[in-house]
């Protein structure tokens, strides 16, 4: 079910760790970039199922924390579940770790219906029904 990184980046050159010094360690077949590990999963799941899948691999759904440090993500195509959810009580958006979305992290497009979000490309996220099926991106710190 794993998707290789090259097609996700639409045949653009993959940023490799050797150019930036050592990066890692990451689980086998995960991508290391700026000391974070990423994996793109091709299997379509609901948001909750995707979250559970990441947790089972000691990771969490994608969090955007820095456009500069996660620059390769601007090349991602298609739509993938990320770790951003709307809090029903006040309508605000926060990451899985409880931190609030800051609008310099990414553009949140709230035109579609939903209280979960998919990552598109160029640091744009789109609201979506959490029960919909999507591919997903897991992320963890390299230790």
């Amino acid at each position: 079910f794993k998707e290789t990184f090259q097609p996700v980046l639409c045949n653009k050159e993959v940023p490799v760790s050797s150019r930036e010094g050592y990066c890692g360690p990451c689980p086998n077949n995960w991508i290391c970039h700026r000391n974070n590990c990423y994996q793109f999963f091709n299997e379509e799941k609901t948001w909750n199922q995707s979250q559970a899948s990441c947790l089972s691999q000691n990771s969490s759904l994608l969090k955007i924390y820095s456009k500069e440090e996660q620059d390769f993500l601007k090349l991602v195509k298609s739509y993938h579940w990320m770790g951003l959810v709307q809090i029903p009580a006040n309508g605000s958006w926060q990451w899985e770790d409880g931190s609030s979305l800051s609008y310099n992290q990414l553009t949140l497009v709230e035109i579609p219906k939903g209280s979960c979000a998919v990552y598109g490309s160029s640091f744009k996220a789109y609201t979506e029904d959490c029960a919909n099926l999507n591919t997903y991106i897991c992320m963890k710190r390299a230790v």
């Epitope: 739509y79 553009t107 497009v109 709230e110 035109i111 579609p112 998919v118």
Partner: antibody, heavy 116, light 111 residues
Framework: EVQLQQSGAELVKPGSSVKISCKAS????????MHWIKQQPGNGLEWIGW????????EYNQKFSGKATLTADKSSSTAYMQLNSLTSEDSAVYFC?????????WGQGVMVTVSS | QFVLTQPNSVSTNLGSTVKLSCKRS????????VNWYQQHEGRSPTTMIY?????PDGVPDRFSGSIDGSSNSALLTINNVQTEDEADYFC??????????FGGGTKLTVL
Amino acid sequence: EVQLQQSGAELVKPGSSVKISCKASGYTFANNFMHWIKQQPGNGLEWIGWIYPGDGDTEYNQKFSGKATLTADKSSSTAYMQLNSLTSEDSAVYFCIRLTEGTTYWGQGVMVTVSS
Amino acid sequence: QFVLTQPNSVSTNLGSTVKLSCKRSTGNIGSNYVNWYQQHEGRSPTTMIYRDDKRPDGVPDRFSGSIDGSSNSALLTINNVQTEDEADYFCQSYSRGVSPVFGGGTKLTVL
């Protein structure tokens, strides 16, 4: 008041290209998606693609990939669509539209006629 | 990718109530918003209903939108139909991100 002013009707020859424009006013052009829609008589509305002028990001309906190219000029708040290798199947009215959380705004449409 | 299916044409009497349907082929109709557009011959479409049931300023309250989960359809209801309501009506929802999907349209004839 939001307005989308499109360029005039076009009569073009098969095999050629055409570039039509959509000038936006009354809102922040860079931070809104601009979509393009094709309408042929009796054929309903077909989504061609969108452009996000803020960063030039685009997405296309697979059917129009290679047929349409979307661009935008932030300085003039104008979106453009180029259609290439035109055939009679491309004869249609083309709309630019701004889809928002609220009402959708439509340009007046550009009639493109492909004829030798 | 799902399809939105609308009846090709509907006829109704002046002053009556008519319901126009928009059926989603796969997936839940409620999982994304539905917008409705009216298009008179030779004109651009205009928004009649957005986000399932909201009416833009200037649209008569004779027009209302709803979601019918049992038939997996969106409905546009027009009460007290007037001659100026004779037009084509299109429903629209979203597939991925903000990519719109349109129904084929319904031609409403007022008798």
